[in-house]
């Protein structure tokens, strides 16, 4: 799998999309996990609704949301209020039994907020009880890693 880079600005929202073959993955739940080290396990962050028919419902874990368009074949992950510690390698997965197929490897990069010299009071973030539909989502910048690029810093 190639790795796709998604860049977002600190403090804003980043949307990651993972296209897949809707027929091949019909009836399967999906998940978003974080890779722990180059050879380490992929730790589950959030997964789609337990009832596959309701996969389009947005599921939250903290500031990360997942929703699945099972007809169109697009899994969408939203990282709200992006922070530097969110940077790293992730995977979109398709689940079947205890197994998981990788749909896409994703490198999340967090760029410094160009407004961070401003007073924090000038910035707006959606409150917990506000509809997420009202929140501004920053369009992500994505690219594939070039061959030979390493998503993790080399370990000594």
């Amino acid at each position: 799998h190639n790795t796709t880079v998604f860049q977002g600005v600190a403090g804003q929202s980043l949307q990651v999309s993972c296209p897949y073959d809707s027929m091949k993955h019909w009836g399967r739940r999906k998940a978003w996990c974080r890779q722990l080290g180059e050879k380490g396990p992929c730790q589950r962050v959030v997964s789609t609704h337990n009832l596959w028919l309701l996969s389009f419902l947005r599921r939250w874990n903290g500031s990360t949301a997942i929703t699945d368009d099972t007809l169109g074949g697009t899994l969408t992950i939203t990282l709200r209020n992006l922070q530097p510690h969110d940077a790293g390698l992730y995977q979109c997965q398709s689940l079947h039994g205890s197994e998981a197929d990788t749909l896409r490897k994703v490198l999340v990069e967090v760029l410094a907020d160009p407004l961070d010299h401003r007073d924090a009071g000038d910035l707006w973030f959606p409150g917990e009880s506000e509809s997420f539909e009202d929140a501004h989502v920053e369009h992500s910048i994505s690219r594939s890693l070039l061959e030979g690029e390493i998503p993790f810093p080399p370990t000594s």
């Epitope: 609704h49 337990n50 389009f56 939250w60």
Partner: antibody
């Protein structure tokens, strides 16, 4: 703002059928699920079934399997619930409810009273 | 099917008091649990989804907690408009089921 408007009260004879409508205004109709829930007089809530309009996929509670049909007409943003072989214990207020974003019963219709009496 | 048992059936309290409502599932529903409020002659209204998330426009005095089989809805300080029937609901597994309800009445 999304609203669900249901058809008016019905009085039916035992053995007959009833078809209740639920018209959605605002929002995208096709993408979301429409469920039907009923409530007998003085009783609790009972889920009957759900339909996803854009795929036409439906799922029904076992109790109503074979007696209930849920359909959706995307062109009019209207969902329907038809219940056949009515009996007196089907007397209830029938609600439609739809998803908005995070959960299956975000928004509810005003309810339709169906009375089954000979 | 998953059975949701709510307790107590009736809770008699005065305005300003704290209300604690319980919902117990016959098997784990993870966090796939919602709470609704229903007043006489009205449709139910969503209060809490995913066990602990307040729905849009719901006052902060309503809070939900729990995971697995045991869940709690807390109303920190009852307002006159909070006297109603409250239902829990799970969508972890088909069929979707509701609890029998807890009536919160004025003492």
């Amino acid at each position: 703002q999304v609203q669900l408007v249901q058809s008016g009260a019905e009085v039916k004879k035992p053995g007959s059928s009833v078809k209740v409508s639920c018209k959605a205004s605002g929002g995208t109709f096709a993408q979301y699920a429409i469920s039907w829930v009923r409530q007998a007089p003085g009783q609790g809530l009972e889920w009957m079934g759900v339909i996803i309009p854009d795929s036409g996929t439906a799922n029904y509670a076992q109790k109503f399997q074979g007696r209930v049909t849920i359909t959706a007409d995307e062109s009019t943003s209207t969902a329907y619930m038809e219940l056949s072989s009515l009996r007196s214990e089907d007397t209830a207020v029938y609600y439609c409810a739809r998803t908005q974003e995070n959960t299956i019963f975000d928004i509810w219709g005003q309810g339709t009273l169906v009375t089954v009496s000979s | 099917e998953i059975v949701l048992t709510q307790s107590p059936a009736t809770l008699s309290l005065s305005p300003g008091e704290r209300a604690t409502l319980s919902c117990r599932a016959s098997q784990s529903v993870s966090s796939y649990l919602a709470w609704f409020q229903q007043k006489p002659g009205q449709a139910p209204r969503l209060l809490i989804y995913d066990a602990s998330n307040r729905a849009t426009g719901i006052p902060a005095r309503f809070s939900g907690s729990g995971s697995g089989t045991d869940f709690t809805l807390t109303i920190s300080s009852l307002e006159p408009e909070d006297f109603a029937v409250y239902y829990c609901q799970q969508d972890y597994e088909w069929p979707i089921t509701f609890g029998g309800g807890t009536k919160v009445e004025i003492k």
